[in-house]
């Protein structure tokens, strides 16, 4: 999946299996990523688990779990708030669009989480105060989560190089990854660009991610995934000048 | 391996009124140089861990983005504290503790928010 970190770094990661997205003293988010096509290194999020830890007189521990084709509007125990404590309403789940869009407000830690199902896969977005991000007691075991650190260099796909290559040659291959042999050959670069331009008129990294996803999968739902990801940034990012991220000319190889 | 404490100090040092990534200031570069020095000091005990290599690459990235020179002054971290997670000795019947922004305003100005997102393939 594509990852935008707390420090506004944008990466495309081929991480497979379960990975910690956020892990601090208040909250733990784990994602499971699976290959989008047989033989492809590109992965997308198929499962999401959020654990809201027990917090003072506000909330009991609550677990939220979403999977492909199952986006519940409740915690796994069936509740929609933080439990029986005095401040239980400082944690709330709201269903925005049935089966497609859920918002979780954790007011006690100033945090908003948006989970969506777009096509077969899940998307995740969060707005969180810096000091909550940084509230980690055991840095050795907790501090390495993806939202904070990004994904390992050897798990990154240089999709900007791919984009440049595709633009120049029409070649459809995944840089630093194995090819996606089952992707429909009938999806030319120009079509991908047109479909992405429709939803994402600004040629930023979200637009580039969209093109990359269409070329590697042939699945138009990824256009919406990029579109909604940007919409969530608009709603959740505190710095309105940083909504659009652009390709940097001076960057390290393999780092988006 | 103490590398992630370096990260923590960097976050603290750059938690001003703007997001760190938008701070093209001498103070930001000073904080970055402190971060770099801190990571160098952990190199021996962290060199084989992902955290160390991520930090080194991240610092190079940010130095380049913000046109920071490698030489120059360094900064001291500004540390703030959040109430402890889990059950605490100090129980409060007031719902204020359960409203982050209200309890935050007592100590300082508006909190500095960050965003993370994951989507697509």
């Amino acid at each position: 999946p594509h990852l935008r970190t707390f420090t506004d770094r944008f990466q495309t990661c081929k991480v497979q299996g379960a990975w910690p997205l956020i892990d601090n003293n208040y909250l733990n988010v784990q994602v499971t990523n699976t290959p989008v096509l047989p033989g492809s290194a590109a992965t997308a999020t198929s499962k999401l688990t959020i654990i809201f830890k027990n917090f003072q007189e506000c909330v009991d521990q609550k677990v939220y779990q979403a999977e492909m084709d199952e986006l519940p509007a409740a915690f796994v125990d069936g509740s929609k708030n933080g439990g029986d404590k005095h401040g239980a309403n400082s944690l709330k789940i709201t269903e925005k669009v049935s089966g497609q869009h859920v918002e979780i407000q954790a007011k006690y830690i100033g945090t908003t989480i948006v989970v969506r199902q777009v096509g077969r896969y899940l998307t995740f977005a969060v707005r969180m105060p810096e000091e909550v991000v940084n509230a980690v007691e055991d840095w050795d075991s907790q501090g390495l989560y993806l939202c904070l650190r990004g994904c390992p260099l050897n798990q990154q796909i240089d999709f900007q190089a791919f984009h440049t290559n595709a633009e120049g040659t029409g070649a459809r291959r995944l840089a630093a990854a194995s090819p996606a042999p089952t992707a429909p050959e009938t999806f030319p670069y120009e079509t991908a660009v047109a479909k992405c331009k429709e939803k994402l008129p600004v040629e930023d990294l979200y637009y580039q991610a969209c093109v990359f996803d269409l070329l590697t999968t042939g699945d138009v739902n990824f256009t919406l995934a990029a579109y909604y990801a940007l919409e969530d940034v608009k709603m959740l990012h505190s710095n309105k000048d940083k909504l659009h991220l652009y390709e940097r000319t001076r960057d390290l190889p393999g780092r988006a | 391996c103490k590398i992630l404490k370096c990260n923590s100090e960097f976050w603290s040092a750059t938690s001003g009124s703007h997001a760190p990534a938008s701070d093209d200031t001498p103070e930001f570069c000073a904080a970055l140089r402190s971060y770099a020095l801190c990571t160098r000091r952990t190199a021996r005990t962290c060199r084989g861990d992902l955290a160390y290599h991520s930090a080194v690459h991240g610092i190079e990235d940010l130095m380049s983005q913000h046109n920071c020179s490698k030489d120059g002054p360094t900064s001291q971290p500004r540390l703030r504290t959040l109430p402890p997670a889990g059950d605490s000795q100090e129980r409060s019947d007031s719902p204020e503790i359960c409203h982050y922004e209200k309890s935050f305003h007592k100590h300082s100005a508006t909190p500095n928010y960050t965003h993370c997102g994951l989507f697509g393939d």
Partner: antibody, heavy 115, light 112 residues
Framework: EVQLVESGGGLVQPGGSLRLSCAAS????????MNWIRQAPGKGLEWIGM????????HYADSVKGRFTISRDNSKNTLYLQMNSLRAEDTAVYYC????????WGQGTMVTVSS | DVVLTQSPLSLPVTLGQPASISCRSS???????????LEWFQQRPGQSPRLLIY???SRFSGVPDRFSGSGSGTDFTLKISRVEAEDVGVYYC?????????FGQGTKLEIK
């Protein structure tokens, strides 16, 4: 909870080979450098070597250089120690340990080199 | 290679009394960036080693505060403020400043 379980030890003749495994759980294995350390019966601890999180670098003690090879499979959360040209002085309990400098250790596996 | 020399090699202590173990290095353990990488491990009878102290004086998580580390350069000390029965075992110092990494020969702590 961090858990490291070594296996593959046993009796081997001088000049023979053995491959030890260390199965890791309770932490994100692919994030950490890993070490092998040994302890001869009734003796102190001896560091054998370490491997970076992504296998990009390996460091060894002089006593095993050229004979022992450390490797890892991050997809299987497993660390390996391939031991060739074994000698009687390699008889020891072999421990794997998490981190560039070891913090959590396994329970060890016994290797006996004898004819 | 860096040689770490521990003393004493055997340390009989009365329960509730303090104990002190010295670790001397054949060369300075301070690196060019000012870091000093000395750790202390405890090995109880029949068990695996356990990390007590890292970076000279930082206590590892879960280690009781009766354990403390100090020192600089070539001279380091592990102190136990009040020895308890569970502290019996062998204590090793370990340096990570220079390759190859090396251990001290160990100090056996026993109850008088």
């Amino acid at each position: 909870e961090v858990q490291l379980v070594e296996s593959g030890g046993g009796l081997v003749q001088p000049g023979g080979s053995l491959r030890l495994s260390c199965a890791a759980s309770g932490f994100t294995f692919s994030y950490y450098g890993m070490n092998w350390i040994r302890q001869a019966p009734g003796k102190g601890l001896e560091w054998i070597g370490m491997i970076y999180y992504d296998s990009s670098e390996k460091h060894y003690a002089d006593s095993v250089k050229g004979r022992f090879t450390i490797s890892r499979d991050n997809s299987k959360n497993t660390l390996y120690l391939q031991m060739n040209s074994l000698r009687a002085e390699d008889t020891a309990v072999y421990y794997c340990a998490k981190g560039t400098t070891p913090d959590y250790w396994g329970q060890g596996t016994m290797v006996t080199v004898s004819s | 290679d860096v040689v770490l020399t521990q003393s004493p090699l055997s340390l009989p202590v009365t329960l509730g009394q303090p104990a002190s173990i010295s670790c001397r290095s054949s060369q300075s353990l301070e690196d060019s960036d000012g870091g000093t990488f000395l750790e202390w491990f405890q090995q109880r009878p029949g068990q695996s080693p356990r990390l007590l102290i890292y970076d000279v004086s930082s206590r590892f998580s879960g280690v009781p505060d009766r354990f403390s580390g100090s020192g600089s350069g070539t001279d380091f000390t592990l102190k136990i403020s009040r020895v308890e029965a569970e502290d019996v075992g062998v204590y090793y110092c370990f340096q990570a400043t220079h390759d190859p990494l090396t251990f001290g020969q160990g100090t056996k702590l026993e109850i008088k």
